[in-house]
């Protein structure tokens, strides 16, 4: 009778994440009697997975059933596989023994090679906003892919950039890998509906890459211009003067009119009308009863936009010389939230 | 302890079936194999057969042509069919229990529990 | 086909050590069972996997086998432990008895 071999046919074994992996093992014997037990690993530092004689090994199936006395089947199955299950399992043939079995025979061994899915990239943008001309970075991460393999880009509003850097986690062998990559944006005045997108590509997506996306809208600030201008006289005596704010971003904006330096009026910007690139516009206007100033009036609309140093644009309003008429000194009626009569 | 009683016809004549059944008291029946075992008068034990739950037989290749053994695990017996029977079939017959439990596999369980025999006689 | 021989007898003195053996071709790569059967009544397990006891059977019964040779050793033995001893093993699939042993205690 020859002497019993064990046969593993299986050199190596690619499974899905999730999916149960068979391990296959056959005997060429039943002689000499004595259990089989399944290993990961080599050497004294081996991992037990399946011990036929005793234990309890909830994700372990036998294809076979064991108990059937011609029995030489002792091929497994491995259910819900991590990347961690990652290795080369060896079919080992034991001989009893007294006390304990000896181990008699091993397979040349199935290495294990586990397919995972990259994590959904996630995109971070700056901590802060950037204006229009500055360049800003944005990181991309995705996690517990395998094998090592994978391919990432990047794009702005459909079109691939160039600018960044990628590196992949750890350099050596592991049973999952991390990626991250680096990209530089330029911003422009017209990126607010703009998009970064990080696309990752890997062999267990079929072709369908994961994308993570980053809106500008978050990283963007467009600071307002100003534009103060004097309107055609409303009524006798009454001036309207209006401070235009265009094109900014985000809508955090509050105004303020001075008059000769001194504080008349403060408001916060609500009723905005929005630009087709998703900036914004605004105006506050100002009624002044020039009746009331001997000299010129010196008219300030001062922005302060998304907490930045406040913006100013101011406007000279010439008054003509006039008799001082009997009671313009008092007090004349507010006629709008965005009116004021000055004295 | 699993216990087992058997019974069946003690008197046959040559060319009829044998058949014999075997009840199963106590234990688990789908952790055994269920044996059966013959004894000619003055001679030593041979084995026949032995069948689990699930049906899975295996025979006395000597025998194999001329024996069933089949299982009732809703009644928990299992019987033994042996046809054309000769006065050589002439013995006791035991049915016994081989337990294969936890730490069990191929080879490392035998007969733990045997029945109390049955005498099965042959003649014409 | 596998084939297991016993010595048709054994004789030993009361409290002696009585020792029955069998034999098979490497024998002792397999499990060896025995079995003790006395006059009238059905055979009874006491040893099984070459050297372990059931439950119940004394101490004085062990077992060994190795190469082509299983021994089951009887210490101390007693007039009770008179009676026909069988070894077993199996062979694909298949149980193989030896002829048995009749031990006598004189």
């Known amino acids: 009778e020859e002497e019993l071999q064990v046969i593993q046919p299986d050199k190596s074994v690619l499974v899905a994440a999730g999916e149960t992996a068979t391990l296959r093992c056959t005997a060429t014997s039943l002689i000499p009697v004595g259990p089989i037990q399944w290993f990961r690993g080599a050497g004294p530092g081996r991992e037990l997975i399946y011990n036929q004689k005793e234990g309890h090994f909830p994700r372990v199936t036998t294809v076979s059933d064991l108990t059937k006395r011609n029995n030489m089947d002792f091929s497994i199955r491995i259910g819900n596989i991590t990347p961690a299950d990652a290795g080369t399992y060896y079919c080992v043939k034991f001989r009893k023994g007294s006390p304990d079995d000896v181990e008699f025979k091993s397979g040349a061994g199935t290495e294990l090679s586990v397919r995972a899915k990259p994590s959904a990239p996630v995109v971070s943008g700056p901590a802060a906003r950037a204006t229009p001309q500055h360049t800003v970075s944005f990181t991309c991460e995705s996690h517990g892919f395998s094998p090592r393999d994978i391919t990432l880009k990047w794009f702005k509003n459909g079109n691939e950039l160039s600018d960044f850097q990628t590196n992949v986690d750890p350099v050596g062998e592991s049973v999952s890998y991390s990626i991250h990559s680096t990209a530089k944006v330029v911003l422009t005045r017209e990126d607010v509906h703009s998009q970064v997108i990080c696309e990752v590509a890997h062999v267990t997506l079929q072709g369908d890459p994961l994308r993570g996306t980053a809106n500008l809208s978050e990283t963007i600030r467009v600071p307002p211009t100003l534009e103060v201008t004097q309107q055609p006289v409303r009524a006798e005596n009454q001036v309207n003067v209006t401070c235009q704010v265009r094109k900014f971003y985000p809508q955090r904006l509050q105004l303020t009119w001075l008059e000769n330096g001194n504080v008349s009026r403060t408001e916060t910007a609500s009723t905005v009308t929005e630009n087709k690139d998703g900036t914004y516009n605004w105006m506050s206007w100002l009624l002044v009863n020039v009746s009331a100033h001997r000299d010129d009036v010196k008219l300030t609309c001062q922005v302060e936009h998304d907490g930045q140093p406040a913006v100013s644009k101011s406007h000279d309003l010439k008054v003509s010389a006039h008799p001082k008429e009997q009671g313009s000194n008092t007090a004349a009626e507010n006629t709008g939230s965005n009116e004021r009569n000055i004295y | 302890q699993v216990q087992l009683q058997q019974w069946g016809a003690g008197l046959l004549k040559p060319s009829e079936t044998l058949s014999l059944t075997c009840a199963v008291y106590?234990?688990?029946?789908?952790?055994?194999?269920w044996n059966w075992i013959r004894q000619p008068p003055g001679k030593g034990l041979e084995w026949i057969g032995e069948?689990?739950?699930?049906?899975?037989?295996n025979y006395n290749p000597s025998l194999k042509s001329r024996v069933i053994i089949s299982v009732d695990t809703s009644k928990n017996q299992f019987s033994l069919k042996l046809s054309s029977v000769t006065a050589a079939d002439t013995a006791v017959y035991y049915c016994a229990s081989s337990h294969y439990g936890s730490g069990s596999f191929p080879d490392s369980y035998g007969m733990d529990v045997w029945g109390q025999g049955t005498t099965v006689t042959v003649s014409a | 086909s596998y084939e297991l021989t016993q010595s048709p007898s054994v004789s030993v003195s009361p409290g002696q050590t009585a020792s029955i053996t069998c034999s098979g071709d490497k024998l002792g790569d397999r499990y060896a069972w025995w079995y003790q059967q006395k006059p009238g009544q059905s055979p009874v397990l006491v040893i099984?996997?070459?050297?372990k006891r059931p439950s119940g059977i004394p101490e004085r019964f062990s077992g060994s086998n190795s190469g082509n040779t299983a021994t089951l050793t009887i210490s101390g033995t007693q007039a009770m432990d008179e009676a026909d001893y069988y070894c077993?093993?199996?062979?694909?699939?298949?149980?193989?008895f030896g002829g048995g042993t009749k031990l006598t205690v004189l």
């Open positions: 069948i689990n739950h699930s049906g899975s037989t």
């Open positions: 077993q093993a199996w062979d694909s699939s298949t149980a193989v």
């Open positions: 099984y996997q070459d050297d």
């Open positions: 106590g234990g688990s029946f789908s952790t055994y194999y």
